[in-house]
Each structure stands twice: as structure tokens, then as C-alpha cells.
Amino acid sequence: AQNITARIGEPLVLKCKGAPKKPPQRLEWKLNTGRTEAWKVLSPQGGGPWDSVARVLPNGSLFLPAVGIQDEGIFRCQAMNRNGKETKSNYRVRVYQIPGKPEIVDSASELTAGVPNKVGTCVSEGSYPAGTLSWHLDGKPLVPNEKGVSVKEQTRRHPETGLFTLQSELMVTPARGGDPRPTFSCSFSPGLPRHRALRTAPIQPRVWEPVPLEEVQLVVEPEGGAVAPGGTVTLTCEVPAQPSPQIHWMKDGVPLPLPPSPVLILPEIGPQDQGTYSCVATHSSHGPQESRAVSISIIEPGEEGPTAGSVGGSGLGTLA
């Protein structure tokens, strides 16, 4: 069979070889397509409900005014010329539709090096057959599941038109110290050969390199966190980061209802002030960072000072 590729919605003419150019003609077209069950016979004197889909022209050719997905299949013509010689024509028709230019939607303007990031979603609408989407970095194909690259794909079919919508979501983990402005693009490759790929406009997100965080230091005065009843304890949260982050305070793992401040003063210490304290620094560019914990405890007169309060871990200090 001769392979014919036709674009959806376009007309198609299939020649019936050996047919006399004008009536009377002894010919018959048989088709087995998505519109038929087994074979449907069309003759020159036909004409009727099938005319919207396929009809025999005066010269014996079969005319399809606007091919559709259901017209994919086999078309055969059997013709006899004036001398009684029989000729057969056999066609396999496949249809295609080129989608609109693919687009990258929900694209990221900034990526963070060293962690997985969603770059964007590539969308292609109105293809047949489905075809495929692929991603490119600086013009080179990106291979999923390699070097921190992952792709999530989805294919949907329109219930009425039968055309496909493809979606491909790209996730990447940029290497530290890599290209600060990588160029990503996406391309649609048709399911039928001989049609070139369609490529999106490129996107160029910035890659942000997170600065390794320095530890949040919690300084306690008096050192060791043990104080006589009625004494004062000063807790200072030191964060080297710029700009200065917001500092909140925790006691026994519960946030204290105080305005943000790098210094917490506990005057006139009483039994209710005993516990484990820490500070939490919240940066605009990364998540919250918690300091080590210190135990604040009360020492009765006669007890040895600094050794009575333990520092760090989850030490509860010495109870009076």
C-alpha cells in the first residue's frame, strides 16, 4: 500500500489508477477506517450521507473534503478500463496535526544551587499523533534521571477533537559554582516523521548560590546559666548574617510571646524562669535557624555556682 500522510482539516484526493477519466466507469472504492466496521463500499453513482467524509469524483478519484482522525485507515480502488483490464490502487492514510508553538508556563525566575527546583512546565496543545516534549539546557538535550534532572509528563486527549495536549514539568538541581544564567528551552517533536520540531522561547532563570550559614551563637550571662534567686540573666543571640535576621526566643521548646530582639533579659529570677532557652534566627532568604539550648537554673546560697547549671543539649539544670 502507498503511504499517504494528510493534515487534519485539509482536503485529500486519492487517485483511482486505471479508471476511465469520465463516466461511465466501472470502479469501486472500499475503505476501512475509523468510520467503518470492516469495509465500506463507495461507488461513482453513490452520493449520500458519506459525501461529507468521502465521495467519488467524476474522474474516479476519491475526494475527502476535510480529513479527520477517523479517516485513518486503508483505501482501495478497483477499476476496469474500457478494454476490461483491471487495476487496483491501495493507500494507507495517516493523519496529523501540528500543534501551536509550545510554551513554558509557571517558569521560575530564580533557582537555588544544590537543591531541586521546578524550572517550569512546557505545554503543547492540539497535536496528532501525540508527539513528544523534550527539554534543552544551553541548546543540549537534558536527559531525565541524570545529574539531578527529573521530568513529570502528562498527556490528555480532547474528548471531541481527539487532539492531544502534552505537559512536561522540569525539575533540576543546579550544581554549585555552575552557570549563573542557564538557558532552558523545550521542544515538541511530532509523532509522524518529516516534520521539524517546534521550540519554545528560551527562559533564563538566575541561579542563586546560598552562602553557607554560620552558626547562631547563644551567649548566657552569668556563664553557665546558674543564678541566685532574684538575680538577673542576660541571653544574647549572635548571628553573623547580613542583613540581620529576626530573633525570636523559645523556652522549653515553646515560643515566648515577646517581640523580636537579639537580647533577652530575665530580671529578678524566680522558680518560674527556670528552664531551657534557645533563640531562633529567621532569615528572609532561608528558613529559621535555631541556636544551641542553655539551661537556666536557680542556686541556693552555699551551692557552687557555674557548675550547677548545665549548658547545651537538653540539660534541665539543677533544681533547688
Partner: antibody, heavy 119, light 107 residues
Framework: EVQLVESGGGLVQPGGSLRLSCAAS????????MTWVRQAPGKGLEWVAS????????YYPDSVKDRFTISRDNAKNSLYLQMNSLRAEDTAVYYC????????????WGQGTLVTVSS | DIQMTQSPSSLSASVGDRVTITCRAS??????VNWFQQKPGKAPRRLIY???NLADGVPSRFSGSRSGTDFTLTISSLQPEDFATYYC?????????FGGGTKVEIK
């Protein structure tokens, strides 16, 4: 609203003529073939005529061929049936319906208009 | 011309009954058969298209099937509003041919 509305029915003498109209609304008229179907009093349904979406091709059963003419005006979203040489057996309710080819066949109907051929 | 022989021409049934109406085509018409419902004084309404497909807005108790040139309309559980006349139509070839109709009446 998607609808078809027929008009033009009435009483006519045998041998006379009548023109039926069908006004379409709520859909893209020129995407569809259109068809006329009739129903004689107390009888079943009978196909009368079909026309393709461009109006270039028309189709009739032998019972009305050469007497009836189906036409359309896509600019006016209208379908017509010109009936000449009317006979008593043409007495029926005439329905206009959307479709007429293998893709869409009579999926939407008008309310019908009565044609009475009598002396 | 293709003949569509519809049977029975009438039937009496009760609400809740399963009802089956058959049309036999005189030659192969593929899947190109529709079923219609018509109530007195009203226009027909398409129920089933291309032998087996339920038209929009039609209750799921209606179904269509095909075996060769035999086409069947089934109402799984007859409802009061289903008492009407039913027609099949072949549209594989001209002239388009309707079956003679089946009147479904209350027993």
C-alpha cells in the same frame, strides 16, 4: 439557546406551492448539513430532503424529487423547502432537523409546521 | 433501497419493566443507526446515535446495541415519562429510512 424554528405551513390546494422556512440559532449553522423530515397524520417519520453545509449538494427521495427543492442561506442561518405540485399525500407536519450526514444525523429538531393539501 | 423492519409495532408494559425494541436492516449499514423517541404532538428527540452511543441529556436506562444488521433499543427500567413512540433510522445510504415505529403503552 440552540434551536430550530419552522414557519410557512398552511392550507394549500393540490397542485399548489408552498415555501417552508427554518430559522436556526445558538450554533454555527454552516458547520452542519440540514434535513427536512415529515410525518403524515397518525403515521411514521419520512425523510424529505437534505443539504450539505455549503448548499452545493442536495439529496431527495424519489417521492419528492423534481417537486421539492431544499436550499439554505448561511448568512441568514436559514433553511428552506420549496414545495411545488403539491399532492394530498404531502399533507404532514414538516420538521427541520440538524445534520444529515454520517457525522451528525438529526440531533436537533424544530417543533414542526403543518402543511395541509386539500381542495 | 434499505428497509428497516422495526418490531414490535406496539407493546404494553408496566413501570419498572425492561423493554426491548428491535430494528433489522435489509443490508449492512455498519454502525449508522440512530434511535428516536416521540411523544404525541411533539418533535422527535434523538436518544442513541451510531447504534450504541447515548445522546446528551438522555437517561442511562436507555441503551443501544448492534449485532450485524440487527439493532436493539433497551429501556432497562421503564419510567412513566418513557411511554411514547420509538423510531430507528438508518443513515448509511440514501434514501434515509426510518423504521415503522414502536408505540410503548401503559399496561
Amino acid at each position: 439557546e440552540v434551536q430550530l424554528v419552522e414557519s410557512g405551513g398552511g392550507l394549500v390546494q393540490p397542485g399548489g406551492s408552498l415555501r417552508l422556512s427554518c430559522a436556526a440559532s445558538g450554533f454555527t449553522f454552516n458547520n452542519y448539513w440540514m434535513t427536512w423530515v415529515r410525518q403524515a397524520p397518525g403515521k411514521g417519520l419520512e425523510w424529505v430532503a437534505s443539504i450539505d453545509n455549503s448548499g452545493d449538494n442536495t439529496y431527495y427521495p424519489d417521492s419528492v424529487k423534481d417537486r421539492f427543492t431544499i436550499s439554505r442561506d448561511n448568512a441568514k442561518n436559514s433553511l428552506y423547502l420549496q414545495m411545488n405540485s403539491l399532492r394530498a399525500e404531502d399533507t404532514a407536519v414538516y420538521y427541520c432537523a440538524r445534520g444529515g450526514d454520517i457525522r451528525v444525523m438529526l440531533d436537533l429538531w424544530g417543533q414542526g409546521t403543518l402543511v395541509t393539501v386539500s381542495s | 433501497d434499505i428497509q428497516m423492519t422495526q418490531s414490535p409495532s406496539s407493546l404494553s408494559a408496566s413501570v419498572g419493566d425492561r423493554v426491548t425494541i428491535t430494528c433489522r436492516a435489509s443490508q449492512d449499514v455498519g454502525i449508522y443507526v440512530n434511535w428516536f423517541q416521540q411523544k404525541p404532538g411533539k418533535a422527535p428527540r434523538r436518544l442513541i446515535y451510531r447504534a450504541t452511543n447515548l445522546a446528551d441529556g438522555v437517561p442511562s436506562r436507555f441503551s443501544g446495541s448492534r449485532s450485524g444488521t440487527d439493532f436493539t433499543l433497551t429501556i432497562s427500567s421503564l419510567q412513566p415519562e418513557d411511554f411514547a413512540t420509538y423510531y430507528c433510522l438508518e443513515f448509511d445510504e440514501h434514501p434515509l429510512t426510518f423504521g415503522g415505529g414502536t408505540k410503548v403503552e401503559i399496561k
